[in-house]
């Protein structure tokens, strides 16, 4: 047994890292692997991560942690039984991969402007939450080309836009995912989309 | 308004044991990372330890492992750090500080004398 | 151990002028420093975090700069209530150090 694609893990800052890897033939990741891992420097156990399958040769591990600071490092073991597969060494601050917004709401009772809010997926207290910007996806269900992407690079989880930008009478989604540039994440995955049927008044022409 | 408050500091000698206080208050102390800062007289300062929300993961200068145990007691919004075997070289201001990369409030400091 | 070192390490200046204080890690700390102000008989008060964020509260004529080993912190335009003594710290790696303090002093 022997790894194929070793482990690379992201963290989302928070409480959890995913490390995920390739085996050199269809394994059993929980029976088979634990992946081991304990922070260097400080006073902490070694805690034990019980892999899940993720395709054929593939394993992917949930790693639970109490909080994350920048300097924490992170010892990993790979083990197949007694047999030590992989060892290596993870900074989550390092590879961030930031929770996805929840909440989308697209409020269309504002004259004739869409008002969308999301809610931060961070607590106050934590580093992230004063430093995510956002890109907001919206696509219409009839016309594929209708796809369009609004980055919102100032803090607050919200984007408004006229209404006339869409096309009227027509099914809209939204969606929305976040990045910090300070720690040079990568993207979230995107929120759940939301859906609403657009509709305006066009102008009263005069003649 | 968020604030800090250290008590505990007084003058012990070589060897023997002092515990020092922190009480937070305008914030919720579990919400947060909690450490100890020493600054020697007329020197820099130094992170001494600190602890996480959880209590579980704790972290402390060489200079101080074995003899500094830091504890947090978050129904009382308060932190702690008992120090055993007093040396002639812990003789400084200890301030309690929020945070756990850098400190972001911190108390107004105790005064720990350690001499003979 | 991660060497903090700043400079200068006292430095005289006028109320109005700009002043650039140094601080030079031994190794790569990418942008995981904080800046403080310390007076005299106070506690230190956080100035700048993330070597470029300015900590709530703090006024715009402090800013930082910097990332890997060089980082700056600049104070446009001197008040009498800036005179103090200014740290780095750096939270790349354990042990957390700081610098030696920079002394800011009324020319």
């Known amino acids: 047994m022997k790894v194929l694609q070793e482990p690379t893990c992201v963290s989302d800052y928070m409480s959890i890292s995913t490390c995920e890897w390739k085996m050199n033939g269809p394994t059993n990741c929980s029976t088979e692997l634990r992946l081991l891992y304990q922070l260097v420097f400080l006073l902490s156990e070694a805690h034990t991560c019980i892999p899940e399958n993720n395709g054929g040769a593939g394993c992917v591990c949930h790693l639970l942690m109490d909080d994350v600071v920048s300097a924490d490092n992170y010892t990993l073991d790979l083990w197949a039984g007694q047999q030590l597969l992989w060892k290596g060494s993870f900074k989550p601050s390092e590879h961030v991969k930031p929770r996805a917004p929840g909440n989308l709401t697209v409020h269309t009772n504002v004259s004739d402007t869409l008002l969308l809010t999301w809610s931060n997926p961070y607590p106050p207290d934590n580093y992230l939450y004063n430093h995510l910007t956002y890109a907001v996806n919206i696509w219409s269900e009839n016309d594929p080309a209708d796809f369009r992407i609004y980055n919102v690079t100032y803090l607050e989880p919200s984007l408004r836009i006229a209404a006339s930008t869409l096309k009227s009478g027509i099914s809209y989604r939204a969606r929305v995912r976040a990045w910090a540039q300070c720690y040079n994440t990568t993207w979230s995955e995107w929120s759940p989309s939301t859906k609403w049927h657009n509709s305006y008044r066009e102008p009263f022409e005069q003649h | 308004q968020v604030q800090l408050v250290e008590s505990g500091g007084d003058l012990v000698r070589p060897g023997g044991s002092l515990r020092l206080s922190c009480t937070a208050s305008?914030?919720?102390?579990?919400?947060?990372?909690m450490s100890w800062i020493r600054q020697a007289p007329g020197k820099g300062l130094e992170w001494v330890s600190y602890?996480?929300?959880?209590?579980?993961?704790?972290y402390y200068a060489d200079s101080v492992k074995g003899r500094f145990t830091i504890s947090r007691d978050n129904a009382k919004n308060s932190l702690y750090l008992q120090m055993n075997s007093l040396r002639a070289e812990d003789t400084a201001v200890y301030y309690c500080?929020?945070?756990?990369?850098?400190?972001?409030?911190w108390g107004q400091g105790t005064t720990v004398t350690v001499s003979s | 151990d991660i060497q903090m070192t700043q400079s200068p390490s006292s430095l005289s200046a006028s109320v109005g002028d700009r002043v650039t204080i140094t601080c030079r890690a031994s190794?790569?700390?990418?942008?995981?420093l904080a800046w403080f102000q310390q007076k005299p008989g106070k506690a230190p008060k956080s100035l700048i975090y993330?070597?470029?964020s300015l900590q709530r509260g703090v006024p715009s004529k402090f800013s930082g700069s910097g990332s890997g080993t060089d980082f700056t912190l600049t104070i446009s335009s001197l008040q009498p209530e800036d005179f103090a003594t200014y740290y780095c710290?750096?939270?790349?790696?354990?042990?957390?150090?700081f610098g030696q303090g920079t002394k800011l002093e009324i020319k």
């Open positions: 602890i996480r929300r959880s209590g579980n993961t704790i």
């Open positions: 500080a929020r945070g756990g990369d850098w400190a972001d409030v």
């Open positions: 190794q790569g700390i990418s942008i995981y």
């Open positions: 993330a070597a470029s």
């Open positions: 305008g914030f919720t102390l579990s919400d947060y990372y």
């Open positions: 710290q750096q939270y790349n790696s354990y042990p957390y150090t």
